[in-house]
């Protein structure tokens, strides 16, 4: 009996430019002889339905149809037919199929590969054209993929123990696509500093599929107006 097992859940997520290993494990009732077996990896793009050969291994012959693609013959002996792709790009997302032949048996498995790019976040103060005591804070998130992103603003006053989500005077612009396929977006918070308590901490919170924990940038309103003491948490997907 020949069986192939891929990543549990059927989806693998990897960061852009990472050296990704797409898992494929072979289960066979007898010890594997790599000279009499074959491995072929196929890829089907998200945008069109045509399947393309990425890598093949037959006996002493192996060929990479995607530069740098490799299946380790040494690991193959112990049933690991995982495909390593260095410097993965956004356009390489899609369905990967691992096909194993141990004559006369054949088995296959598929996995969806999602390529994500983590946003970088920065906080800017824009006072151009603003009235006295009125400030505009801009939270710029750039270089992220996929497009879906959630930007919220929170504040924590001196007295109250937990943050409060701010919904008024927040405008989040449209996402803009970059040349490399990643996206940028800016969210703006308008504040009337004369109406706010000194010591109140404001925070721009960015949530994205690529992040384990939200990306936070904050500033504190001081008695002498405001201090942009930006702290960024960049605990990205790994």
């Amino acid at each position: 009996d020949l069986k192939v097992e891929m990543m549990a859940g059927g989806t693998q997520i990897t960061p852009l430019n990472d050296n990704v290993t797409i898992f494929c494990n072979i289960f066979y009732s007898q010890p594997l002889n790599i000279t009499s077996m074959g491995i072929t990896w196929f890829w089907k793009s998200l945008t069109f339905d045509k399947e393309v050969k990425v890598f093949e291994f037959f006996g002493d012959h192996q060929e990479a149809f995607r530069p740098g693609a490799i299946v380790s013959p040494w690991r193959l002996k112990s049933g690991d037919a995982s495909l390593r792709l260095p410097g993965i790009q956004l356009e390489e997302a899609g369905e990967y199929r691992c096909e194993v032949v141990v004559t006369p048996l054949k088995a296959q498995g598929t996995v969806q590969l999602e390529v994500v790019a983590s946003p970088a976040s920065r906080l800017l103060l824009d006072q151009v054209g603003m009235k006295e005591n009125e400030d505009k804070y801009m939270c710029e998130s750039s270089g992220f993929y996929p497009e879906a992103i959630n930007i919220t603003w929170e504040k924590q006053t001196q007295k109250f123990p937990h943050p409060i989500e701010i919904s008024e005077d927040v405008i989040t612009g449209p996402t803009i696509k970059n040349m490399d396929g990643t996206f940028n977006v800016t969210s703006c918070l308008k504040l009337n500093s004369s109406q706010e308590d000194p010591g109140t901490v404001y925070q721009c919170v960015v949530r994205h599929a690529s992040l384990h924990t939200p990306l936070r940038s904050n500033f504190t309103l001081t008695a002498a107006r405001h201090s942009l003491s930006e702290t960024e948490k960049t605990d990205n997907f790994s």
């Epitope: 924590q156 123990p161 937990h162 943050p163 989500e165 936070r216």
Partner: antibody, heavy 117, light 107 residues
Framework: QVQLQQPGSVLVRPGASVRLSCKAS????????MNWMKQRPGQGLEWIGG????????DYNEKFKGKATLTVDTSSSTTYMDLSSLTYEDSAVYYC??????????WGQGTTLTVSS | DIVMTQSQKFMSTSVGDRVSVTCKAS??????VAWYQQKPGQSPKALIY???NRYDGVPDRFTGSGSGTDFTLTITNVQSEDLTEYFC?????????FGAGTKLELK
């Protein structure tokens, strides 16, 4: 990292008074507000009151007015809570809690007050 | 004062199960609700703020929901370390008030 140090336990007689302390470190002490909480076994948590750590403002739960008095010593970064005319009902764990420099609240380990004759 | 009611003092669950702890406010508190976990002999630890936002470092099996007067803390795939007590807290106004707590125990 914010740390709030409280004595582990205190034993007092009924009718007496007691001063509980809470020493803060790891953040800009005078900038913040310190709350005090009471927890009796099986009775949930109660907010007693709070004090602005520069000492210029306090706020109390009506239920604890006359029972608790909050003060602060900025030189030692310590907040105090005085409890007067102690009864058995005052036996509880008392926590100090603050916001600190970062989002979220921080709690001391709590002081177990036992009122017993 | 705003009264926070946790109607179930105890709830039975098993490791791997999904469990929902509920809390009801006596008046509209918007989303100004936090959830705390308290293990025996320890001080409470905040898990959720603004009704549904997880604090950093809190496992994603903890989910908060609700607004207005009805709030829920859901734990999916309950772990043995989750079998402890949970409190809700409103922070829309002083005095801050808490629910009486719900203790999760093994079925």
């Amino acid at each position: 990292q914010v740390q709030l140090q409280q004595p582990g336990s205190v034993l007092v007689r009924p009718g007496a008074s007691v001063r509980l302390s809470c020493k803060a470190s790891g953040y800009t002490f005078t900038n913040y507000w310190m709350n005090w909480m009471k927890q009796r076994p099986g009775q949930g948590l109660e907010w007693i009151g709070g004090i602005y750590l520069n000492g210029d403002s306090t706020d109390y739960n009506e239920k604890f007015k006359g029972k608790a008095t909050l003060t602060v010593d900025t030189s030692s970064s310590t907040t105090y809570m005085d409890l007067s005319s102690l009864t058995y009902e005052d036996s509880a764990v008392y926590y100090c809690t603050t916001r600190g420099d970062y989002f979220g609240d921080f709690w001391g380990q709590g002081t177990t007050l036992t009122v017993s004759s | 004062d705003i009264v926070m009611t946790q109607s179930q003092k105890f709830m039975s669950t098993s490791v791997g199960d999904r469990v929902s702890v509920t809390c009801k406010a006596s008046q509209n508190v918007g989303k100004y609700v936090a959830w705390y976990q308290q293990k025996p002999g320890q001080s409470p630890k905040a898990l959720i703020y603004s009704a549904s936002n997880r604090y950093d470092g809190v496992p994603d099996r903890f989910t908060g929901s609700g607004s207005g007067t009805d709030f829920t803390l859901t734990i999916t795939n309950v772990q043995s370390e989750d079998l402890t007590e949970y409190f809700c807290q409103q922070y829309i106004s002083y005095p801050l008030t808490f629910g009486a707590g719900t203790k999760l125990e093994l079925k």
